[in-house]
């Protein structure tokens, strides 16, 4: 039930990606607002994004305090012009989110290869380890801190001159790998946690191949 | 429940082709990687290789390089493994299985390839 | 390619014995070493990840150690549905490979 004049949002869609997390809704607006709250499951209900007329509210700042609780979200509406009108329950119309917990459902983003060196018949790949906006003691997390060993990285190599691939593992962000001497090679990287059920990889980092800048050979 | 049930196998004369299926049930491959593995009678497990079914990449044991072709349809939920030039030597059970990346946690029953002419 | 050496191939024990099968690697493969049990006609089942980590259903009877190029799957008290095939597989670089197998029998 509510007000003739406002309608419910719907489709509430939780969009994360290295816990940049947004939340989505519809309809757009026709003469009314929306404001967003969210909480934790045992917590307080905190207000975001107050009577605005886009249909999406960053909620980063908020679950980032604790990436492994399961946060709830709701999207309230409001005629325009006439916020305190509530609907006939005596209360605000509002839809609750899906939950959401931002360490087992964020998307993982896709990787950056960082570096590779040649020496020899071994070549260190190194991917990037991405800022995230998770906080501790006022200094910003990368992935890698955040994960630990819950995040892999797979590499996919092959020579230039071939389309056969291979693969290797590793928990670190570095992988050192045995190549041919003489043969260029490209790379590409993802990152994988396994223990996810949903969500679990990422796309497949752009390729890099030696003989390019980013890479350095010493004999 | 995760099911993974593998099709397609049978007798195939030397020199022959085969496409087996591996149906999969109560996950979405697109977020696993999935493998093909063969056991000769009586012998071990042998690699054959694997496939993102989500960014379609695809490794294969050197050895089957040549010969081996993995594919999957995501809208059917499906592995598949071709395998050209059969011979008597490529006669084993071959087993399809989900892999997290830590490890291999469901495989199939297995599908019997026998090559003979 | 990475070679993975299983030791022994077989062996007679009794319901209750210690039984430990070993697995050892031609490099290192940095702990990306996974146990499987297989019985006759079935397909294998996963038992150890990552070298020490015990799979989801398993008895903690079974146990992983080792680093480095060398492994260790440990059955503490053997009981009769632990009569079978044991290998040992290496998954941190393609190809993925798998040691000969060790057939644990009645003695």
């Known amino acids: 039930s509510g007000t003739t004049n406002t309608v419910a949002a719907y489709n509430l869609t939780w969009k994360s990606t290295n816990f940049k997390t947004i939340l989505e809704w519809e309809p757009k607006p026709v003469n009314q607002v929306y404001t967003v709250q969210i909480s934790t499951k045992s917590g307080d209900w905190k207000s975001k994004c107050f009577y605005t007329t886009d249909t999406e509210c960053d909620l980063t700042d908020e679950i980032v305090k604790d990436v492994k609780q399961t946060y709830l979200a709701r999207v309230f509406s409001y005629p325009a012009g006439n916020v305190e009108s509530t609907g006939s329950a005596g209360e605000p119309l509002y839809e609750n989110s899906p939950e959401f917990t931002p360490y087992l459902e964020t998307n993982l983003g896709q990787p950056t290869i960082q570096s590779f060196e040649q020496v020899g018949t071994k070549v260190n790949v190194t991917v990037e380890d991405e800022r995230t906006l998770v906080r501790r003691n006022n200094t910003f997390l990368s992935l890698r801190d955040v994960f630990g060993k819950d995040l892999i990285y797979t590499l996919y190599y092959w020579k230039s001159s071939s389309s056969g691939k291979k693969t290797a593992k590793t928990n670190t962000n570095e992988f050192l790998i045995d190549v041919d001497k003489g043969e260029n090679y490209c790379f590409s990287v993802q990152a994988v946690i396994p223990s996810r059920t949903v969500n679990r990889k990422s796309t497949d980092s752009p390729v890099e191949c030696m003989g390019q800048e980013k890479g350095e050979f010493r004999e | 429940e995760v099911q993974l049930v593998e099709s397609g196998g049978g007798l195939v004369q030397p020199g022959g082709s085969l496409r087996l299926s591996c149906a999969a049930s109560?996950?979405?491959?697109?977020?696993?990687?999935m493998h093909w593995w063969r056991q000769a009678p009586g012998k071990g497990l042998e690699w054959v290789g694997l496939i993102d079914p989500e960014q379609g990449n695809t490794i294969y044991d050197p050895k089957f390089q040549d010969r081996a072709t993995i594919s999957a349809d995501n809208s059917k939920n499906t592995a598949y493994l071709q395998m050209n030039s059969l011979r008597a030597e490529d006669t084993a059970v071959y087993y399809c299985a989900r892999d997290t990346a830590a490890y291999w946690d469901y495989l199939g029953q297995g599908t019997l390839v026998t090559v003979s002419s | 390619d990475i070679q993975m050496t299983q030791s022994p191939s077989s062996l007679s024990a009794s319901v209750g014995d210690r039984v430990t099968i070993t697995c050892r690697a031609s490099?290192?493969?940095?702990?990306?070493l996974n146990w499987y049990q297989q019985k006759p006609g079935k397909a294998p089942k996963v038992l150890i990840y990552y070298a020490t980590s015990l799979a989801e259903g398993v008895p903690s009877r079974f146990s992983g150690s080792g680093s480095g190029t060398d492994y260790t799957l440990t059955i503490s008290s053997l009981q009769p549905e632990d009569f079978a095939t044991y290998y040992c597989?290496?998954?941190?670089?393609?190809?993925?490979?798998a040691g000969q197998g060790t057939k644990v029998e009645i003695k």
């Open positions: 109560g996950f979405n491959i697109k977020e696993y990687y």
């Open positions: 597989l290496q998954h941190g670089e393609s190809p993925w490979t």
């Open positions: 490099r290192d493969i940095k702990s990306y």
